[in-house]
C-alpha cells in the first residue's frame, strides 16, 4: 500500500538505504513530498515488524515497486493512496 503523508516533523530521514526489501516484509510505503521543513522527497518503508527504513528514492527496486503498486491501484479497487497527517 502506498501512502502520501504530510507531517509536521521536518525531515524524518537522515540516512537512506538502497538495499532491497522483499515485498513480504513490507507493511506500507510512505511517500513524503518535499516541503513542510524538509527540502527533499522521502520514502519510508514500514516493515511488518514495526521497524522503518528510509529508502533512497533513486533506488531502482523502490521505483519499480511503486510503479507496480500504482498500476495495480489504478486498475482495481479504490486507489490505496491516501493523503493523511498523523496529528
Amino acid at each position: 500500500v502506498l501512502e502520501v503523508y504530510y507531517t509536521s516533523l521536518r525531515c524524518r530521514c537522515v540516512q537512506e538505504s538502497s538495499v532491497f526489501i522483499p515485498r513480504r516484509f513490507i507493511d506500507r510505503i510512505q511517500i513524503l513530498p518535499r516541503g513542510n521543513g524538509c527540502p527533499r522527497k522521502e520514502i519510508i518503508v514500514w516493515k511488518k515488524n514495526k521497524s522503518i527504513v528510509c529508502v533512497d528514492p533513486q533506488a531502482e527496486w523502490i521505483q519499480r515497486m511503486m510503479e507496480v503498486l500504482r498500476k495495480r491501484s489504478s486498475s482495481t479497487l479504490p486507489v490505496p493512496v491516501f493523503k493523511r497527517k498523523i496529528p
Epitope: 507531517t7 524524518r12 537522515v14 506500507r28 516493515k47 514495526k50 522503518i52 493523511r84 498523523i86 496529528p87
Partner: antibody
C-alpha cells in the same frame, strides 16, 4: 486536540488483577502508525514502560512484566486497557496512558500523556 | 535492556543559570543516522511532558531555552537561562531497542 484519560480503581488487593482503561479523543486508535501504551511511576521513583499496542493489534511488553500484563484496545469505543495480574505492593504507582508520536514505529517516543491515575495495592 | 544513567541525580540552581543534565546509555541508541533519545519534564503531581525528541529536536511549544545534543551513548539537555517554571524533574528515554527505557531522573531544585 489529542487527549487521554485514565480510569480504574484506586485500590487493589494483593494477588488480585489491576484493570485500567484509557479513553482517548482527537485521534483514532486504528490510524496507520498509531500506537498507545502504559507507563507507571512508583511513589518517589522514576518512569517504567509497561506495554504498548499498535493500530494493527501488535502488542509489545516490558519483559520484566510480560507474564502478568495484558494490553488490549477497543477501537469502537476509543479505549485501550491494561490488566496486571497477581499484584503486590511493588505495583503501587501512578499509571499513565500515553500516545506514541507515530513517526518511527518501533523506535518512537511518547508525545502525549494522560494525567495519570494512582493505584494502591493494599489489603 | 539498555540502561540509562542520568547525572546528576539532583541539582540546585538559580533563576538565570545555565544548566546541563547528562544521560548515558549502556549502548548506542543510534540508528539510521538518528539518535533515538528523548527528554521529558515532569512537575510534581503532573504527567511527564515531551521536551526534546531525536536527541535535539524541540517539541512544538517548548521554549527555545531548552536544547538537546549528543549521539551514540552520551547526551545532554541544556537549559540556557533557568526560569522559575523550569524547576522540575527531567527524564531521558531511549527507544532504539525494546524495551524502551528511562533514566532515573534529575531533580532540578531552586538554590
Amino acid at each position: 486536540q489529542v487527549q487521554l484519560q485514565e480510569s480504574g480503581p484506586g485500590l487493589v488487593k494483593p494477588s488480585e488483577t489491576l484493570s485500567l482503561t484509557c479513553t482517548v479523543s482527537g485521534f483514532s486508535l486504528s490510524t496507520f502508525g498509531m500506537g498507545v501504551g502504559w507507563i507507571r511511576q512508583p511513589p518517589g521513583k522514576g518512569l517504567e514502560w509497561i506495554a504498548h499496542i499498535w493500530w494493527d493489534d501488535d502488542r509489545r511488553y516490558n519483559p520484566a512484566l510480560k507474564s502478568r500484563v495484558t494490553i488490549s484496545k477497543d477501537t469502537s469505543k476509543n479505549q485501550f486497557s491494561l490488566k496486571l495480574s497477581s499484584v503486590t505492593a511493588a505495583d503501587t504507582a501512578v499509571y499513565y496512558c500515553a500516545r506514541i508520536a507515530g513517526y518511527y514505529g518501533s523506535r518512537d517516543w511518547f508525545a502525549y500523556w494522560g494525567q495519570g491515575t494512582t493505584v494502591t495495592v493494599s489489603s | 535492556d539498555i540502561q540509562m544513567t542520568q547525572s546528576p541525580s539532583s541539582l540546585s540552581a538559580s533563576v538565570g543559570d545555565r544548566v546541563t543534565i547528562t544521560c548515558r546509555a549502556s549502548e548506542s541508541v543510534d540508528n539510521m543516522g538518528i539518535s533515538f533519545m528523548h527528554w521529558y519534564q515532569q512537575k510534581p503531581g503532573k504527567a511527564p511532558k515531551l521536551l526534546i525528541f531525536r536527541a535535539s529536536d524541540l517539541e512544538s511549544g517548548v521554549p527555545s531555552r531548552f536544547s538537546g545534543s549528543g549521539s551514540g551513548t552520551d547526551f545532554t539537555l541544556t537549559i540556557s537561562s533557568l526560569q522559575p517554571e523550569d524547576f522540575a524533574t527531567y527524564y531521558c528515554q531511549q527507544s532504539n531497542k525494546d524495551p524502551w527505557t528511562f533514566g532515573q531522573g534529575t531533580k532540578l531544585e531552586i538554590k
